[in-house]
Interface confidence: low
């Protein structure tokens, strides 16, 4: 009898243990991706970045996808998601087309119901990067709390892409779930 | 028969309740680290940061350990890091050596294992800080989702240390844990 | 007996998950707050922004208020709060009334026990906004981990509100619970 | 720079109105911090009295809410003191001074006026 | 309301030594508190805040301490021009509070 309740509560408390870390590890899916330099575009219109890194160096993801440039939403929930984005010249790069800049990037999300993409956040700034200085930098930081659908999907978009600075530590976005939705 | 079975049904809740209540607490550390201007260095060459305060105003610290100017990791996990960095001046502290200033912050990873440091994310601006005005701000906001070891360690490097605005709502890095490793 | 003792197992499952499930939502507020550009105040002057959507595209709240222009807390925790602000002028509005410009944030925190505000977060940059040039764009992004109790009031206060971006994706705060205070 | 400079008369006698004036150059009142008063007694002893913050809201020490009252002009960048009822433990020195964003320490300080209640 | 205690209502020292001034808080502050310096015939001037971080341009030989009731602020190689009456203040609560302060004076 009461070894018989014992062994119950044993696999009660197992079987909770082994629920609570599973559904732990199944709620928290996560991705930082860096950017992948090999195939930056180049130019000074805005584009969509297409080449990202997910499993080398700070690069990582699980229970999520990426593809074609995008970070798929594999669990419904609200996640926190996140970029930084690093722009740097330097003149030994050659002259600028124009030193009037405007240095941007717009997180998107991309809804399977609705083929459109909608930005869910941007920053940026206007720069006046003049011959006087040999070198400029400047980075943007943008992040925010969203709702987000299995299939839905996150992509970057920046202006003046041939300015991107390649570094893992520099140019990267990424996204970690919060909590499910109710 | 019934009524120890319903004592053994409370000692699971109640076990589960204290276990659920531990584990969730001692899953999450977190810091949040405000910058110690008493001790901050001079120049405008690059340095570590590593006086911060972790027990007044704003900054706390559970489950992980601030020594020698670095936040240590004692519990594995991926973590949220962020650092905001303040940059000032103004013209009652004197001329600046060189009105182009290069404002950066860098988030550094010491492994154990591997004793050099890594740079997780960086940030900052090129700036020309004309003596035509006669005050000058400028902040950085980086942010990152990150595997941590224990005993791992973070630290903060910036450039143009002297100009930091030494407010704890201005310079400040911290960070918190998401979740366990797989 | 056997049969008795899988009921109550079934019982302390069922319980648990209801339990888990019911904590699990409790314990996470959050807010994602987008600019209600219907009324931004006008000038050059810092402001407190009191009008903020929570229920219209990316604004969303749960277990938290907002309430005469600031996020109320209703559940003590450990928050992690953000804010993203862009100013922005295009020529077509008319000359500022200087080029000179300081575009600040601050994430302010009244307490009810200090009917005072106290600035928990800041970030911004001086500006030289020129006539030559026909647009300026300038983004700001703070983020950080702090200790709320129910009561406390989050707001943002801003410089030159006039210059600010409309669009949800570009002035927004917002906070989400990741612990409980010990 | 900030400056601040306190304005009023030096005598006033019992049971009328003290009114004293703050006068702030290098920033504007409505910018940014709280603006206090604060007094201080013949042996030093300082009271704090009360502030205005930039938005306009106002606190006040619960000891004399009932006889004082801070105000503004924004326009003349200047706040203000309304002090009713002043007996002869009002003689102090009057200071005005500016408080820190995130910290209600004071960073800026006027001279100070002082004032003696006297019949 | 939160009464800030100084003990000493004066202190003597020498140039050179290091002196310790003390404040007690009746109720725990945190670290909600700030010192002043006020020498004869001018207004007090901000010293530290947060209980232990210099205000901009105020000399290292400055240090403050404490937390919760009991603060300390400390003046090492003490100089004549450091004659004055430092006072402490609290600001966890309103109303704002400030210590009876301690003359120091220069043997």
């Known amino acids: 009898g009461s070894q018989h309740i014992r062994a119950e509560k044993a696999m009660v408390d197992g079987s909770w243990l082994d629920l609570a870390k599973r559904s732990k590890l199944e709620a928290q899916p996560f991705a930082h991706l860096t950017i992948n330099a090999t195939d930056i575009p180049s130019g000074s219109h805005k584009v969509s970045l297409s080449s990202w890194y997910h499993d080398r160096g700070w690069a990582k993801i699980s229970n999520m996808t990426f593809s074609n440039g995008k970070l798929i939403v594999n669990q419904d929930g609200f996640y926190y998601l996140y970029a930084n984005i690093c722009f740097r010249h330097h003149e030994t790069s050659g002259d600028l087309a124009t030193e009037y800049l405007q240095l941007m990037v717009y997180v998107t999300k991309t809804s399977i119901k609705i083929p459109s993409s909608h930005t869910l956040m941007k920053g940026g700034s206007t720069k006046y990067w003049s011959g006087n200085s040999e070198f400029h930098f400047y980075s943007i930081n943008v992040g925010g709390f969203f709702k987000l659908r299995s299939g839905e999907e996150i992509s970057i978009e920046v202006s003046n892409p041939s300015l991107l600075d390649p570094d893992q530590d520099a140019t990267y976005f990424g996204a970690f779930k919060v909590r499910d939705i109710d | 028969g019934s009524q120890h079975i319903r004592a053994e049904k409370a000692m699971v809740d109640g076990s589960w309740l204290d276990l659920a209540k531990r584990s969730k607490l001692e899953a999450q550390p977190f810091a949040h680290l405000t910058i110690n201007a008493t001790d901050i260095p001079s120049g405008s060459h690059k340095v570590s940061l590593s006086s911060w305060y972790h027990d007044r105003g704003w900054a706390k610290i559970s489950n992980m350990t601030f020594s020698n100017g670095k936040l240590i990791v004692n519990q594995d996990g991926f973590y949220y890091l962020y650092a905001n960095i303040c940059f000032r001046h103004h013209e009652t502290s004197g001329d600046l050596a060189t009105e182009y200033l290069q404002l950066m912050v860098y988030v550094t990873k010491t492994s154990i294992k591997i004793p050099s440091s890594h740079t997780l994310m960086k940030g900052g601006s090129t700036k020309y800080w004309s003596g035509n005005s006669e005050f000058h701000f400028y902040s950085i906001n980086v942010g990152g989702f990150f595997k941590l070891r224990s005993g791992e360690e973070i630290s903060i490097e910036v450039s143009n240390p002297s100009l930091l605005d030494p407010d704890q709502d201005a310079t400040y890095f911290g960070a918190f844990k998401v979740r366990d490793i797989d | 007996g056997s049969q008795h003792i899988r009921a109550e197992k079934a019982m302390v499952d069922g319980s648990w998950l209801d339990l888990a499930k019911r904590s699990k939502l409790e314990a996470q507020p959050f807010a994602h707050l987008t600019i209600n550009a219907t009324d931004i105040p006008s000038g050059s002057h810092k402001v407190s922004l009191s009008s903020w959507y929570h229920d219209r595209g990316w604004a969303k709240i749960s277990n938290m208020t907002f309430s005469n222009g600031k996020l109320i807390v209703n559940q003590d925790g450990f928050y992690y709060l953000y804010a993203n602000i862009c100013f922005r002028h295009h020529e077509t509005s008319g000359d500022l009334a200087t080029e000179y410009l300081q575009l600040m944030v601050y994430v302010t925190k009244t307490s009810i026990k200090i009917p005072s505000s106290h600035t928990l977060m800041k970030g911004g940059s001086t500006k030289y906004w020129s006539g030559n040039s026909e647009f300026h764009f300038y983004s700001i992004n703070v983020g950080g981990f702090f200790k709320l109790r129910s009561g406390e009031e989050i707001s943002i206060e801003v410089s030159n509100p006039s210059l600010l971006d409309p669009d949800q994706d570009a002035t927004y705060f917002g906070a989400f619970k990741v612990r409980d205070i010990d | 720079d900030v400056q601040l400079q306190e304005s009023g008369p030096d005598l006033v006698k019992p049971s009328q109105s003290l009114s004293l004036t703050c006068t702030v150059t290098g920033y504007s009142i409505s910018s940014g911090y709280s603006w206090h008063w604060i007094r201080q007694f013949p042996g030093n002893k300082l009271e704090w009295m009360d502030y205005i913050h930039f938005s306009g809201s106002t606190n006040y020490n619960p000891s004399l809410k009932s006889r004082i009252s801070i105000t503004r002009d924004t326009s003349k960048n200047q706040f203000f003191l309304q002090f009713i009822s002043v007996t002869t433990e009002d003689t102090a020195t009057y200071y005005c001074?500016?408080?820190?964003?995130?910290?209600?320490?004071?960073?800026?300080w006027g001279q100070g006026t002082s004032v003696t209640v006297s019949s | 309301d939160i009464v800030m205690t100084q003990s000493h209502r004066f202190m003597s020292t020498s140039v050179g030594d290091r002196v310790s001034i003390t404040c007690k808080a009746s109720?725990?502050?945190?670290?909600?508190v700030g010192w002043y310096q006020q020498k004869p015939g001018q207004s007090p001037k901000l010293l530290i805040y947060?209980?232990?971080i210099r205000d901009t341009g105020v000399p290292d030989r400055f240090t403050g301490s404490g937390s919760g009731t009991d603060f300390t602020l400390t003046i090492s190689n003490v100089q004549s021009e450091d004659l004055a009456d430092y006072f402490c203040?609290?600001?966890?609560?309103?109303?704002?509070?400030f210590g009876g302060g301690t003359k120091l004076e220069i043997k």
């Open positions: 203040q609290h600001y966890n609560s309103y109303p704002l509070t």
């Open positions: 947060w209980a232990s």
């Open positions: 001074a500016r408080s820190g964003p995130s910290t209600y320490v004071m960073d800026y």
């Open positions: 109720q725990d502050v945190g670290a909600a």
